[in-house]
């Protein structure tokens, strides 16, 4: 029977800068029941607080609701593991909520084959930003990435779309059915999951780009 091993806070994520959750990995339990507590203080403060919500994020997590979440302030947090034989502490983790946003996938993905008379045909892809993200304030810049592939192909073709919410693709295989998905990330932050796939049938007379 031993004191617990050192835990590690390994991930923090926020869907929208208004709430966030951090998760830790327990160390060894020393063969005894072990209690975990997360404490934190904000940059410039000395007053320590305990995690406000150990439930919402699931096991080994701490969830910070709206009233506990401040943007532009660094949180300094650590996890304490305690059993009958002693305690151990994680390294301190510095967290700025602005940098841990992982948005929901983009919405309303629409894909259409355009065949203008005077130009080469192209695939036109359009989407909307996720609803929880408020782009109007200027606090967010979302970057987008598109991936597509013929239905039976193994490899995805990836295109970086920057900040635009529509994109044209010229080089496609005629007669193939394509899957198209889009994802987004804040300029500092994490990629969302890919959106649900949209399928598009490329006409047989679609001319490949030179």
């Amino acid at each position: 029977q031993l004191p617990p091993g050192k835990p590690e806070i390994f991930k923090c994520r926020s869907p929208n800068k208004e709430t966030f959750t951090c998760w830790w990995r327990p160390g060894t339990d020393g063969g005894l029941p072990t209690n975990y507590s997360l404490t934190y203080h904000r940059e410039g403060e000395t007053l320590m607080h305990e995690c406000p919500d150990y439930i919402t994020g699931g096991p080994n997590s701490c969830h910070f609701g709206k009233q506990y979440t401040s943007m532009w302030r660094t949180y300094i947090m650590m996890v304490n593991a305690t059993n009958q034989m002693g305690s151990s502490f994680s390294d301190e983790l510095y967290v700025d909520v602005t940098y841990i946003v992982q948005p929901d996938p983009p919405l309303e993905l629409a894909v259409e084959v355009k065949q203008p008379e005077d130009r080469k045909p192209y695939l036109w892809i359009k989407w909307s930003p996720p609803t929880l993200i408020d782009l109007k304030t200027g606090w967010f810049t979302l970057l987008y990435e598109i991936r597509l592939k013929p239905e039976k192909a193994a490899e995805w073709e990836i295109h970086f779309a920057g900040q635009q919410t529509e994109f044209k693709i010229l080089s496609l295989h005629p007669g193939q059915k394509y899957l198209v998905q889009v994802r987004c990330k804040p300029d500092h932050g994490y990629w969302s999951a890919w959106s649900p796939a949209t399928f598009i049938q490329i006409p047989s007379d679609f001319t490949m780009n030179d």
Epitope: E8, F10, K11, C12, R25, E43, G44, T74, D91, L93, Y94, V95, D96, T98, Y99, I100, K185, H188, Y190, W191
Partner: antibody, heavy 120, light 107 residues
């Protein structure tokens, strides 16, 4: 204990490439951005670029954009910096440096440095 | 790119002295400034982040202040182990840039 252990010194010819490695231990590699900073002999520090090992998303200093490639191998917890078209002014100590937290780019842990000498 | 201009480039001081190093940004950087200490042949060590916050384990004799474009690192009572070169760094906008360094030497 957090450690960043870099590969050994290199001597390279002008026009060639160098690839420096940085093996991380003592923490979850994918949690923090990794940066590369260089220091020419007797000179100051110069930031080259950064990578998020969780998805290999990277940003570069435009000064090096066409010559530097930063990669990360999650399976070995190792970051790499490759610099191509070397010239004599690239002679420097190259450091990997871990982001201080989940936040802006200040650097709390540094590798020991790798001296790259470019000479004909 | 944002230029970070440090002054002085070197300073001679004695143990127990108060040493002040300044860093001026070429444009507004808020409080997105860090300070590092570097000894010969070693990697830099973080002292201060967000202009005024001491990093874990850094002695209280080191303090940082400033916002906007003007920043200061103060060593309140210089110790023998503090003789080194000090660098400021801005992380407000890409590319992240460092000052030219200030060497603190023994008088």
């Amino acid at each position: 204990e957090v450690q960043l252990v870099q590969s050994g010194a290199e001597v390279k010819k002008p026009g060639s490439s160098v690839k420096v490695s940085c093996k991380a231990s003592g923490y979850t590699f994918t949690t923090y951005w990794m940066h590369w900073v260089r220091q020419a002999p007797g000179q100051g520090l110069e930031w080259m670029g950064e990578i998020d090992p969780s998805d290999s998303y990277s940003n570069y200093n435009q000064k090096f954009k066409d010559r530097v490639t930063i990669t990360a191998d999650k399976s070995t917890s190792t970051a790499y910096m490759e610099l191509s078209s070397l010239r004599s002014e690239d002679t420097a100590v190259y450091y990997c440096a871990r982001n201080g937290g989940l936040g802006p780019a200040w650097f709390s842990y540094w590798g020991q440095g790798t001296l790259v000498t470019v000479s004909s | 790119d944002i230029q970070m201009t440090q002054s002085p480039s070197s300073v001679s001081a004695s143990v127990g002295d108060r040493v002040t190093i300044t860093c001026k940004a070429s444009q507004y950087v808020g409080t997105a400034v860090a300070w590092y200490q570097q000894k010969p042949g070693k990697a830099p060590k973080l002292l201060i982040y967000s202009a005024s916050n001491r990093y874990t384990g850094v002695p209280s004799r080191f303090s940082g202040s400033g916002s906007g474009t003007d920043f200061t690192l103060t060593i309140s009572s210089l110790q023998p182990e503090d003789f080194a070169t000090y660098y400021c760094q801005q992380y407000s906008s890409y590319p992240w840039t460092f000052g030219g360094g200030t060497k603190v030497e023994i008088k």
